[in-house]
């Protein structure tokens, strides 16, 4: 049958639209299916019908059940069913699956999270937004009309987002909350011939003898997850591991994702207690992926 699931929390407003929609001029009659009892249209009732809408102000657990709406045009009567479930408020922060609206996916370019069902309500901005029950704060989060925008979306922005707003009916205010999951998807990935961001080719770095210094090799390989992408240092054309000088150590490469979505890797070469002989070495920053190898050379000079 033509039915739709609706759910809400006790002591909150719940407004349900007849799944069988018609013109606004069509008459809609609502019934409680179990008893075939007509739902009143007078607004003084806690539960009342208002055209296409059935309003629970506020909802109670006992309101759960199937409601029938019959939409009447001049020549046709069409029936819909609203399956309404009202749940008790959860004592802890967890939002169970049965209270979740459809999951939405976002990416760096598109990070809108719409507040579910809000169009049915008489609400005024701004909305309050929570992630995993924590109020969202900071300039990255912008509550705009009926949706939340997240700037520079990252994978750890995934989670359960709850919008909270006030429905106003004849001067009385009722709270409404709705929760949906947000997942972050990679934009379509691709790989490029490596691009070394630092150091510049044939760069010279001034250092103090006896001091410590760091050299950073930073290279980008495309967008999204990369199958093969390595960044490493060589000394006079030899691997660091083959160069038996404990003062010179290479850190494990750190993955980095920039706001433009580029997948980059940084590898730091740490030189402790710089000596005269270090100035004679050639330091090669190597970036390698399936497309090939790129090398930038840097030398050290005395300050």
């Amino acid at each position: 049958k033509f039915s739709k699931q609706s759910w809400g929390l006790e002591n909150e407003a719940l407004i349900v639209r007849c799944p069988r929609q018609g013109k606004s001029s069509y008459i809609v009659d609502w019934y409680y299916s179990q008893t075939n009892k007509s739902i009143p249209t007078q607004e003084r009732n806690r539960v009342f019908a208002s055209g296409q809408l059935l309003k629970f102000l506020p909802a109670e657990v006992a309101d759960s059940g199937i409601y029938t709406c019959i939409v009447r045009s001049p020549t046709f009567n069409r029936t819909g069913y609203a399956n309404v479930t009202i749940y008790k408020k959860q004592p802890d922060c967890n939002v169970p699956d049965y209270l979740m609206y459809s999951t939405v996916s976002g990416s760096e370019k598109n990070s809108k999270i719409y507040c579910p069902t809000i169009d049915l309500y008489n609400w005024t901005a701004p909305l309050e937004w929570f992630k995993n029950c924590q109020a969202l704060q900071g300039s990255r989060y912008k509550a705009h009309k009926s949706f939340l925008v997240i700037d520079n979306v990252m994978t750890d922005d995934a989670g359960d987002y709850t919008c909270k707003f006030i429905h106003n009916e004849n001067g009385a205010n009722y709270s409404v909350t709705a929760t949906r999951s947000f997942t972050v998807k990679d934009e379509q990935g691709f790989s490029l011939f490596p691009v070394i961001r630092a150091p510049a080719h044939n760069e010279t770095k001034e250092v103090e003898i006896g001091e410590n210094t760091n050299l950073t090799c930073s290279a980008c390989f495309g967008k999204g997850a990369q199958f093969l992408a390595t960044v490493q240092w060589q000394l006079n054309g030899n691997k660091i591991t083959d160069f038996s000088e404990p003062r010179i150590q290479q850190e494990e490469g750190q993955n980095q994702s920039f706001s433009n979505g580029l997948a980059c890797v940084n590898t730091v070469l740490r030189i402790a207690d710089v000596k005269e002989e270090d100035l004679l070495l050639r330091y090669d920053c190597l970036a390698l992926n399936l497309h090939g190898l790129r090398r930038h050379t840097i030398r050290l000079s005395r300050k």
Epitope: K1, F2, Q21, G22, K23, S73, T75, F76, R78, T79
Partner: antibody, heavy 123, light 107 residues
Framework: EVQLLESGGGLVQPGGSLRLSCAAS????????MIWVRQAPGKGLEWVST????????YYADSVKGRFTISRDNSKNTLYLQMNSLRAEDTAVYYC????????????????WGQGTLVTVSS | EIVLTQSPATLSLSPGERATLSCRAS??????LAWYQQKPGQAPRLLIY???NRATGIPARFSGSGSGTDFTLTISSLEPEDFAVYYC?????????FGQGTKVEIK
């Protein structure tokens, strides 16, 4: 009494054009979705196009998209189907029909039909 | 698009007999399904809408049932004027589609 009367059918060569009209009476034409459905000789019914009521959108079957244009003149209570680049497989009786429910983005049954106009595409 | 398959293609029955026509959808159409009757040289006539509701003026011997993908049109006792071709139509979304038709002929 609701009445729909199609006209404009006839014989046309492949690649040619034809404009069908459907004159409506007996109801408030402007608020209803209107539809063209065709039936090739000895075959079943095929939906061709829908135009929504009250300035709504237009919808086309893939087989006619880019060649046929549905339109309406609410002041004349008339529905049109402009058919260009006609092919032999467009040969059919073309019916205009009314969708009595007419809500945005949804479709319903066809409660009143015209008697149809025959379009023959042949060289 | 949603494909509607009607069976049988032809049904040979005598007046007074019960006719059972089937329409199967390639995916669920909820109850957004209609049945039409078409006689030679005439336009189709709406019989049933929303799977089971009779249109205005349709005799009680016509009834529809089903939901989702499987639907049935039943004519409880065939009258001479019921011999015709019957089409099902879904309207859950664009493009609306019709079945290929079932011809009910006199045995």
């Amino acid at each position: 009494e609701v009445q729909l009367l199609e006209s404009g059918g006839g014989l046309v060569q492949p690649g040619g054009s034809l404009r069908l009209s459907c004159a409506a009476s007996g109801f408030t034409f402007s608020i209803y979705d209107m539809i063209w459905v065709r039936q090739a000789p000895g075959k079943g019914l095929e939906w061709v196009s829908t135009i929504k009521g009250e300035g709504g959108g237009t919808y086309y079957a893939d087989s006619v998209k880019g060649r046929f244009t549905i339109s309406r003149d609410n002041s004349k209570n008339t529905l049109y189907l402009q058919m260009n680049s006609l092919r032999a497989e467009d040969t059919a009786v073309y019916y205009c029909a009314r969708d009595p429910w007419s809500t945005e983005g949804s479709f319903f049954v066809l409660d009143y039909w015209g008697q149809g106009t025959l379009v023959t595409v042949s060289s | 698009e949603i494909v509607l398959t009607q069976s049988p293609a032809t049904l040979s029955l005598s007046p007074g007999e019960r006719a059972t026509l089937s329409c199967r959808a390639s995916q669920s159409v909820d109850d957004d399904l209609a049945w039409y009757q078409q006689k030679p040289g005439q336009a189709p006539r709406l019989l049933i809408y929303d799977a089971s509701n009779r249109a205005t003026g349709i005799p009680a011997r016509f009834s529809g049932s089903g939901s989702g993908t499987d639907f049935t049109l039943t004519i409880s006792s065939l009258e001479p004027e019921d011999f015709a071709v019957y089409y099902c139509q879904q309207y859950i979304g664009a493009p609306i589609t019709f079945g290929q038709g079932t011809k009910v002929e006199i045995k």
